[in-house]
């Protein structure tokens, strides 16, 4: 059946002619008010002159995704403004393919290739102009737009400088071969932010890595500030759709944040999976294992489909400060499997943190070193001391009786007591390593409901210092 689009346009299935009519290139000049006439068209040089297109400057193409509303959404205008503010001489072009995107999702997917071809033809034409270089082109695509950018990069004659995929769409792209989705082959540097990946239901964002570096903020799934309770506060009804939009669109806002909050850059750390990152294992910057996110991401050699992780705040600025904590729990008797709840408070030269929970990803290893990830929203400065609390309530009579019996048979230490001599801390952002020791080496034990204080006793862990992200990425 021949399907008609609103406004009488045919779908992309009817070929490039239809796409040509359905794709517009709106050149957003920062020179004065927005001019309606600044639409670029292959073969028409006048708009380039009229609207002061700078051939030697960076050129950004912003590509929206599938839309139910049929209108350009607010995020796009914010992104345009942020780019213009950060790169004052740059050209910013909005690829408007609304007539093809404002369809059933599946039909919009089937139009992505032909829209990508349309973008490639625009780039091919611009390459014929003096001073224009594909190396200066940065395609930024959100959701379906990320795959459009991929197709454009694939079809263009030459290699585009950079493609940023902002939560590339998942349905109909997950698991397909590289020629049918965004891939590292589509530009000299492809960086991707994944903010809505789900293993249950349908994953709106693609789960698989599709770039040179693939960054998964907060594990790529539950974004802070996007829970049903959070969206309930801002709308009449907190619905799943609001959560989906919040989490999917978070990729855009993280990118905008990287443009406007230059003084608060966020860093991501290479890791094989989210669980290992949650354990605090992956906070290294050696061998390019950390990178800036969003606009501040840097191309590193020989990286492809590299997964990177970070935690973020619930809103702008999104930056947090990551710390790896290594704690060796000594247990003087067999206490079986215990599941303690520990909290830490970090005290620094600038501020003290909130009470932070130590997330136990698997199980506490007794008589073993356990690694934890904690993060703070504020810059604490140089760490001075740490308070560790073992959450616990007053025990039942049965617990007390068991403890008393245990004491009779082994009158040394109560059951469910652990000993901790030191805490080793590494800052993700500065890569500094510090060791914190108990004040009195004789008083190292902690039981439920108790706290233990640790004071900085050594710079480093008696290990070679690593480079910090600020040094590496400057």
């Amino acid at each position: 059946a021949e399907e008609q689009l609103e406004g009488g346009l045919r779908t992309a299935k009817d070929g490039p002619a239809a796409a040509k009519a359905a794709v517009r290139f709106h050149f957003r000049t920062s020179k004065g008010p927005e001019r309606e006439g600044c639409y670029l068209s292959v073969g028409h040089s006048q708009p380039l002159e009229d609207c002061s297109f700078n051939m030697t400057a960076k050129t950004f193409f912003i590509i929206h995704g599938w839309t139910m509303s049929g209108m350009l959404e607010n995020w796009l205008h914010k992104l345009v403004s942020a780019l213009q503010m950060r790169e004052k001489d740059a050209n910013v072009v909005v690829v408007d393919w609304l007539p093809l995107a404002h369809q059933l999702y599946t039909d919009a997917v089937n139009s992505t290739r032909v829209v990508g071809l349309s973008v490639a033809k625009m780039l091919d034409w611009l390459q014929g102009k003096d001073g224009f270089s594909l190396g200066n082109v940065h395609l930024i695509g959100y959701s379906l737009g990320a795959h459009v950018a991929g197709f454009a990069g694939n079809f263009v004659k030459g290699t585009v400088g950079r493609i940023t995929g902002l939560d590339p769409a998942g349905p109909m792209f997950e698991g397909v071969d590289i020629h049918r989705r965004l891939s590292p082959d589509d530009a000299d540097f492809v960086d991707v932010l994944h903010t809505y990946t789900r293993s249950f239901g349908i994953s709106i964002g693609i789960q698989m890595p599709v770039g040179h570096i693939d960054i998964y903020p907060n594990g790529g799934d539950f974004q802070p500030g996007c829970g049903l309770n959070d969206v309930l506060g801002s709308i009449a009804y907190g619905t799943i759709a609001e959560v989906v939009k919040c989490e999917h669109e978070r990729a855009v806002h993280l990118f905008v944040d990287s443009l406007v909050n230059q003084d608060k850059p966020s860093f991501a750390f290479q890791c094989t999976d989210s669980n290992r990152f949650k354990k605090g294992i992956c906070l290294s910057c050696r061998k390019n294992r950390c990178n800036g996110i969003g606009y501040n991401a840097k191309k590193t050699r020989n990286k492809r489909n590299t997964k990177m992780y970070l935690k973020t705040r619930a809103g702008m600025p999104f930056r947090v400060y990551h710390y790896q904590m290594k704690i060796h729990f000594f247990s003087y008797k067999s206490v079986g499997a215990i599941e303690p709840t520990f909290y830490v408070t970090l005290y620094g030269t600038n501020a003290e943190s909130q009470v932070l929970s130590l997330e136990i990803v698997e199980q506490i290893g007794l008589n073993a070193t356990n690694t934890f990830l904690v993060y703070t929203e504020e810059d604490l400065g140089d760490l001075l001391k740490i308070k560790l609390t073992w959450e616990g309530t007053s025990r039942s009579w049965y617990d007390l009786w068991r403890e008393f019996r245990s004491y009779l048979s082994q009158p040394h230490r109560p059951e469910r007591e652990l000993s901790i001599r030191r805490i080793r801390v590494k800052s993700g952002e500065t890569q500094r390593r510090l060791t914190f020791c108990v004040e009195d080496p004789e008083k190292t034990s902690i039981a439920p409901g108790q706290e233990l204080w640790f004071y900085k006793c050594r710079d480093g862990w008696r290990m070679k210092n690593e480079t910090s992200p600020t040094v590496e990425l400057s």
Partner: antibody
Framework: QVQLQQSGAELVKPGASVRLSCKAS????????IHWVKQRSGQGLEWIGW????????KYNEKFKDKATLTADKSSRTVYMELSRLTSEDSAVYFC????????????WGQGTLVTVSA | DIQMTQTTSSLSASLGDRVTISCRAS??????LNWYQQQPDGTVKLLIY???RLHSGVPSRFSGSGSGTDYSLTISNLEQEDIATYFC?????????FGGGTNLEIK
């Protein structure tokens, strides 16, 4: 919780028109598309079209584009379907249902409105 | 338009049985296949979306599978409340189309 409340049964004469309503509650009305589906007695389901209150966007099944007209009143959170030039072929139960984006499924359905066309 | 075919229009089974209902599309629908249950009182409910994803509140005895053009719905342990008519629907392209339905009865 999400609810779609449809208007009551209608007995109409051939050649006349009828307007069915579907009142939505329990979610942000402008965020979801409402679809209409026809079921003739003892038969299968036929998709009529959709209405998206967020931008008044409408899509029709080619088969129904001269039969059905979809509109909405945002203030009352209600979507309407008007059926014109009724014949006995239009005698059926008409359902409204809410579209789930990306999955292209109809997650919540109204209880249905029976339309009987008879002289 | 994409044709959806449910070859079995009626099916008898005993309580506790494992029941499978099939559905075929006239072309590849990329897993955009949904299953609905219509109860005897006419109430329609979504059971499975996107081939295999269970809609919230649907018992885990319902499951879906398939790819390309062939899909199926399985009820692992038939209960009395499952007696109903089951429809498949493709959401791959407009117009959306439904299968003719499979009426499930007790033996």
């Amino acid at each position: 919780q999400v609810q779609l409340q449809q208007s009551g049964a209608e007995l109409v004469k051939p050649g006349a028109s009828v307007r069915l309503s579907c009142k939505a509650s329990g979610y942000t009305f402008t965020k979801y598309t409402i679809h209409w589906v026809k079921q003739r007695s003892g038969q299968g389901l036929e998709w009529i079209g959709w209405f998206y209150p967020g931008s008044d966007s409408i899509k029709y099944n080619e088969k129904f584009k001269d039969k059905a007209t979809l509109t909405a009143d945002k203030s009352s959170r209600t979507v309407y379907m008007e059926l014109s030039r009724l014949t006995s072929e239009d005698s059926a139960v008409y359902f409204c249902a809410r579209h789930e984006e990306y999955t292209n499924s109809l997650a919540y359905w109204g209880q249905g409105t029976l339309v009987t066309v008879s002289a | 338009d994409i044709q959806m075919t449910q070859t079995t229009s009626s099916l008898s089974a005993s309580l506790g049985d494992r029941v499978t209902i099939s559905c075929r599309a006239s072309q590849d629908i990329s897993n955009y296949l949904n299953w609905y249950q219509q109860q005897p009182d006419g109430t329609v409910k979504l059971l499975i979306y996107y081939t295999s994803r269970l809609h919230s509140g649907v018992p885990s005895r319902f499951s879906g599978s398939g790819s390309g053009t062939d899909y199926s719905l399985t009820i692992s342990n038939l209960e009395q409340e499952d007696i109903a008519t089951y429809f498949c629907q493709q959401g791959y392209t407009l117009p959306w189309t439904f299968g003719g339905g499979t009426n499930l009865e007790i033996k």
